[in-house]
Interface confidence: low
């Protein structure tokens, strides 16, 4: 009689109850031993890295039977040796024991270089009883075979805590070559040696490559694995890919694509993302980079003014970000910009360009030859000045604003006045007599007060008595101050 | 330490729309881009667009130019993102992300997402 | 439009295992401007690779990048239980910013 089972998570006893389809009622075996505790078998196929093979072991057990008839050494019976199968076959394989009815729950477990090949479905272990022992079948079958699954197979049996181990069984797939290490895409210097490498194994081995380069074979006569392909230069963009070889046939690496190195492309989409009076942002999407990484960016800036000059200026720039402050420009001035990217191999041309303008700003000078004089009669101070020059407005005039300070034993007073963007003069009224009037002005625009001038002090004296001599500050580059009275 | 926290989640019927908040806080709000991606149930990712807070340069995924407008606060340092005209197929996880000036770049930091449900 | 896409989309694999995910692009993109995403579920994405082959902070280094071209790899080895996420790759060459489709990587 046969009894089939398939293994699960505990012992399976060697007898438990009556046997199926066994003709005998009465398996009550001579001696009960107890089987090693927490002993799982284990059946499930894993694949794992190949370890050391198991050689076969024999267990000689002590115990005897109720005649006292010594009992013979238990061992695995031998078996195919070595087994060699083509990639996604089928294959079965199995190791056999007899063992004496006196043990009982004996469990047989399938280990895998070295390591136990748990909860697998590909394990069935077969019993076939007779009167005084029970051959075992333990078969391990794998439905398509893959190149993991290569390696040495033992079966391991404990019987009163006594291993016995078979002899191992090797298992070789053979397929088509497997890369290990395939050609990998590059950017290259235009004429310029390069290497690529291609690995592949078997079994079976020898594997051979040959070498294709834009669906050409490089080389007449194929180089065993490893082989690297020196390639003296190239002035075009090629793809390279490698063939492997062996008895079972042949693969072909995936193709890539060697690029030559250019000069990139120029930026895009330049735009302004903000202006100040003496400063543009700006920010570029960067063209192709030639297959080569940019390494700084050049920025071109000239005035839109068809009356300047023409000079361009340029300010140069890291790669990264793509953003780029300009500064030390005019305020209200228009310019055109453009930008331009280098990499290894040089400089791309200018990307379109655009125009830009800055923003009003605060006057960056003060109103030159500020005097300041008394005219007693009226009780007033008349005030007179220069305005800044247009370049130094930057902006729009749209007047002045005027600071006059009065100070007297013990009193400080400060006014502020403004004028009207045409005026070059004011007046004001007598604050405070026996006193010191101190002027400033600055101009101002719709982007901001400007500096105010350096202080101007008239003395105003008690009713009565005349100055007739007016303060004043000089203009730049003159010795003498111009009076304007 | 940087932080990107998202409003709550919504739920719409067709038609309407929906606005998401995005509150930064860790790092200077004007020098980086805010970024707006989002995420169907059990599919990837999807750009919407970015907006530079320090002028309000935006650029946007023509897929969504005209339904999505991206502002911000920066007084509050909150950027959003608002969808109009919502179908059933914008029912989604938005995103802000952070993204340096150079926009094009990656995100390095990721708001917890905000759930919107279109459903009628 | 720049498409990227990813293989493959589902993994299934056992710890300590190594892992490759590649992703190819349509038309070719700078190294510079190729990153990579994980994203837990329930999370958001967290930056896991930058410029193709740098290590965002906090990333362990079993996680790199390669890749040129058209074709970019993201390579985990010696998998780990806590690896279990989607993946996802980035380009910035140009706008729309894309993300491949995505890898799922499930621990058996």
């Known amino acids: 009689a046969i009894t089939e089972a398939r293994e699960e998570a505990k012992p399976y006893p060697l007898f438990p109850g009556p046997f199926p389809g066994s003709l005998q009622t009465d398996h009550t075996p001579l001696l009960s031993l107890p089987h090693a505790s927490g002993y799982q078998p284990a059946l499930m196929f894993s694949p794992t890295q190949p370890g050391r093979p198991h050689t076969g072991n024999v267990a000689i057990p002590q115990v005897t039977s109720v005649e006292s008839k010594p009992l013979p050494p238990l061992a695995f019976k031998h078996t195919v040796g070595h087994i060699i199968l083509s990639e996604h076959k089928g294959v079965k394989f199995n190791c056999s024991i007899s063992v004496p009815n006196i043990y009982q729950d004996t469990t047989i477990s399938w280990w895998k270089d070295g390591k136990e090949l748990l909860g697998a479905h590909h394990a069935i272990t077969q019993f076939y009883p007779d009167d005084e022992v029970t051959a075992i079948i333990a078969s391990f079958s794998i439905t398509s075979v893959q190149r993991s699954d290569n390696g040495s197979y033992i079966c391991k049996m404990k019987i009163n805590n006594e291993e016995i181990v078979s002899d191992p069984i090797y298992i070789e797939v053979q397929g088509l070559p497997h890369f290990t290490k395939q050609p990998e895409s590059m950017n290259v210097t235009r004429n310029t040696a390069f290497n690529l490498t291609c690995q592949a194994v078997g079994p079976p081995e020898p594997v051979n490559i040959f070498w294709v380069q834009n669906s050409s074979r490089v080389n007449e006569q194929p180089e065993k694995s490893p082989s690297v392909l020196t390639v003296p230069g190239l002035t075009e963009m090629a793809v390279f890919s490698c063939e492997a070889h062996n008895d079972k046939g042949l693969t072909v690496s995936k193709g890539v694509q060697i690029n030559i190195k250019a000069i990139p492309s120029p930026p895009t989409e330049v735009s302004i993302r903000n202006s100040t009076a003496h400063s543009i942002l700006i920010s570029w999407v960067p063209g192709f980079d030639g297959y080569s990484p940019f390494r700084n960016c050049s920025i071109q800036v000239k005035e839109a003014d068809p009356l300047s000059n023409g000079s361009v200026m340029i300010f140069n720039t890291s790669a990264l970000p793509h953003l780029y402050q300009i500064k030390q420009l005019q305020a209200l001035a228009n310019y055109s910009i453009g930008v331009s990217c280098m990499n290894e191999i040089g400089w791309s041309a200018v990307s379109p360009w655009i125009l830009a303008s800055t923003t009003e700003g605060a006057p960056s000078v003060a109103p030159l030859n500020v005097t300041v004089f008394l005219n007693e009669s009226s009780d007033n101070v008349d005030i007179r000045w220069m305005k800044p020059p247009t370049k130094q407005q930057d902006g729009e005039l749209v007047g002045y604003r005027i600071s006059h300070v009065w100070q007297s034993a013990g009193i400080s007073k400060e006014l502020l006045e403004e004028v009207g963007q045409n005026g070059s003069r004011a007046r004001i009224s007598v604050q405070v007599h026996n006193a010191t009037c101190t002027v400033r002005i600055a101009a101002v625009t719709r982007g901001g007060v400007g500096p105010f001038s350096d202080p101007v002090k008239i003395f105003i004296p008690a009713h009565g008595w005349v100055d007739y001599a007016p303060s004043s500050t000089p203009a730049p580059g003159n010795a003498d101050p111009v009076l304007i009275i | 330490q940087v932080q990107l926290v998202q409003s709550g989640a919504e739920v719409k019927k067709p038609g309407a729309s929906v606005k998401v908040s995005c509150k930064a806080s860790?790092?200077?709000?004007?020098?980086?881009?805010i970024n707006w991606v989002r995420q169907a149930p059990g599919q990837g990712l999807e750009w919407i667009g970015w907006?530079?807070?320090?002028?309000?340069?935006?650029k946007y995924n023509e897929k969504f130019k005209g339904r999505a407008t991206l502002a911000v606060d920066t007084s509050t340092s909150t950027a959003y993102m608002e969808l109009r005209s919502l179908r059933s197929d914008d029912t989604a996880v938005y995103f802000c992300?952070?993204?340096?000036?150079?926009?094009?770049?990656?995100?390095?930091?990721w708001g917890q997402g905000t759930t919107v449900t279109v459903s009628s | 439009e720049i498409v990227l896409t990813q293989s493959p989309d589902f993994q299934s694999v056992t710890p300590k295992e190594k892992v490759t995910i590649t992703c190819s692009a349509s038309?070719?993109?700078?190294?510079?401007?190729f990153h990579w995403y994980q994203q837990k579920p329930d999370q958001s994405p967290k930056l896991l690779i930058y410029r193709t082959s740098n290590l965002a902070s906090g990333v362990p280094s079993r996680f790199s990048g390669s890749g040129s071209g058209t074709d970019y790899t993201l390579t985990i080895n010696s998998l780990e239980a806590e690896d279990a996420a989607t993946y996802y790759c980035q380009q910035g060459r140009s706008v729309p910013l894309t993300f491949g489709q995505g890898t799922k990587l499930e621990i058996k």
């Open positions: 038309s070719i993109i700078s190294s510079n401007y």
């Open positions: 992300t952070r993204g340096y000036y150079d926009n094009l770049y990656y995100f390095d930091y």
């Open positions: 907006i530079y807070p320090r002028d309000g340069y935006t």
């Open positions: 860790g790092y200077t709000f004007t020098t980086y881009d």
